[in-house]
């Protein structure tokens, strides 16, 4: 989890002096509990917006939205902690909002928004808005939290990001697997534009099951530059195994920008259908 | 010195209903996500659910899921698992245990043991 | 969902042997998987989360690796200590499977 490598963050609107601070995710006020606390959070929304650096990368953000209650308790509120915490790995970031000038309620209900948190890839996150000063041990929460899951690299829009780019999401092998006579498989798929080997990953199992009966690996060089963008063809010998009839192919790039974690494709090839046996019929009709 | 210590476990019989409690100490408990884990006796691991620090996030293992629900009580630095439908093959020490920042889990329960049978 | 298989179920090794256990998962996780060690009767302890980075206050004789789909753990120096069970766990996203576990024991 990181804050994009932005210009000076702001958080300063018409009719409010802010600044954004980074925080350790725990406010002095559970420290120094205040007796008046303003109300939580209204209308937490959280959108995948897309961002620049300054390098010119193009990372997901978390675009965080709120509003406030339209109640007296805005006289007391002095900011905000924005917390990010990444489900899988429980790592949290914080940034805090300082109001340097007291709110004063006007014609319009007040809106903050922050799009700053750089996030993963497929990954969940829980985002917190946490209204400051925090309230005493026993006070009603002001906090408003919402899940938000990021899109894989799969998602169009996230696919020319940097991350998944990085990862190889822009090749597409646009894989065929045939089923040949003789216990054989015919792959197809497109190389990249690298010069750089690949790996298929051949894994069969029975009609029904998720135990595989027949794994095999077959390695391909590194194609040479007049072949890229090249259809590859590789034929695979699978093992004589009655019921070992439903294959899963999945090729594995090494790309230089994501070496032995690059996304990976997988074709499913499924077993045949098996006819339903008719009643047999008699080589003569009885008379009777 | 962080801890955490389970309760409620206990002999039920099939169809039967049982609530987990795990009470954490030593840390800053409404910082973390914290997981159920259990073991079958003589089998390996299975983790049963995870929930994030302000409950916006659970998630269950398919083969508790609809029977079992998973809660916390920041206020009260705890952790529940509340089962209901229980099976047989509910039967198991569960754990429940804190994730490590970066991954894993490193502080975990001694355990409370869940027997199910008729 | 992703399944977790590891190699060997069990192994039985001499003391100052090195000792591999393979764990894989059945698509890409990058390296979002974590190695416990459970010794009879106690409860698991993490040894290394992120495929390499041992956990503070295990011995420097365990160390991981790998990324992506195929993972190793390795014990430098069989120690008698260190028989227990040893359990991989993916945690890229959930559920946040367990491998079926590899028992350790010293001939």
């Known amino acids: 989890l990181r804050l994009l490598d932005h210009r000076a963050l702001v958080c300063s609107q018409p009719g409010l002096n802010c600044t954004v601070k980074n925080s350790t995710c725990l406010d002095d006020s559970w420290i120094h509990p205040r007796n008046l606390t303003p109300s939580s959070p209204k209308d937490l929304q959280i959108q995948l917006h897309f961002a620049h650096t300054q390098q010119g990368d193009l990372f997901p953000v978390a675009h965080i939205e709120w509003t406030l209650q339209t109640d007296a308790s805005i006289l007391y509120l002095e900011g905000a902690e924005l917390s990010v915490l990444q489900l899988n790995t429980n790592e949290r970031l914080c940034v805090r909002f300082e109001f340097l000038s007291k709110l004063r309620h006007h014609h319009r209900r007040w809106r903050f928004t922050f799009s700053h948190f750089v996030v993963d890839p497929d990954q969940e996150y829980e985002v917190t808005v946490h209204h400051l000063p925090k309230p005493i041990p026993d006070g009603d929460p002001n906090h408003q939290s919402k899940n938000f899951l990021v899109p894989d690299c799969e998602h169009a829009r996230m696919k020319v990001t940097t991350p998944c780019m990085s990862s190889g999401s822009l090749w597409d092998p646009n894989i065929t697997v045939e089923t040949l006579e003789a216990h054989q498989l015919r792959v197809s798929f497109t190389l990249w534009n690298e010069s750089t080997h690949y790996q298929i990953l051949l894994t069969s199992f029975p009609h029904m099951e998720n135990h595989s009966c027949f794994e095999h690996m077959h390695h391909i060089p590194a194609p040479r530059p007049e072949e890229f963008h090249q259809r590859s063809n590789v034929t695979l010998t699978l093992r004589n195994l009655k019921g070992c009839c439903r294959h899963q192919v999945q090729i594995q790039p090494f790309f230089s920008s994501c070496l032995n974690d690059c996304l990976r494709h997988s074709a499913t090839v499924s077993c045949p259908e098996m006819p339903d046996t008719p009643e047999p019929i008699p080589d003569y009709m009885p008379l009777w | 010195e962080v801890q955490l210590v389970e309760s409620g476990g206990g002999s039920v019989q099939p169809g039967g209903s049982l609530r987990l409690s795990c009470a954490a100490s030593?840390?800053?408990?409404?910082?973390?996500?914290m997981n159920w884990v259990r073991q079958a006796p003589g089998k390996g691991l299975e983790w049963v659910s995870i929930?994030?620090?302000?409950?916006?996030?659970?998630h269950y293992a398919d083969s508790v899921k609809g029977r079992f629900t998973i809660s916390r009580d920041n206020a009260k630095n705890s952790l529940y698992l509340q089962m209901n439908s229980l099976r047989d093959e509910d039967t198991a020490v569960y754990y429940c245990a804190r994730p490590k920042v970066g991954g894993g889990m490193d502080v975990w329960g001694q355990g409370t043991t869940v027997t199910v049978s008729s | 969902d992703i399944q977790m298989t590891q190699s060997p179920s069990s192994l039985s090794a001499s003391v100052g042997d090195r000792v591999t256990i393979t764990c894989r998962a059945s698509?890409?996780?990058?390296?979002?998987l974590a190695w416990y060690q459970q010794k009879p009767g106690k409860f698991p302890e993490l040894l290394i989360y992120?495929?390499?980075t041992l956990q503070s206050g295990v011995p420097s004789r365990f160390s991981g690796s790998g990324s992506g789909t195929d993972f190793t753990l390795t014990i430098s120096s069989l120690q008698p200590e260190d028989v227990a069970t040893y359990y991989c766990?993916?945690?890229?996203?959930?559920?946040?499977?367990f491998g079926p576990g590899t028992k350790v024991d010293i001939k």
């Open positions: 929930i994030s620090s302000r409950s916006s996030i659970i």
């Open positions: 766990q993916k945690y890229n996203r959930a559920p946040f499977t």
């Open positions: 992120a495929a390499s």
């Open positions: 698509q890409g996780i990058s390296n979002y």
């Open positions: 030593g840390f800053t408990f409404s910082s973390y996500s």
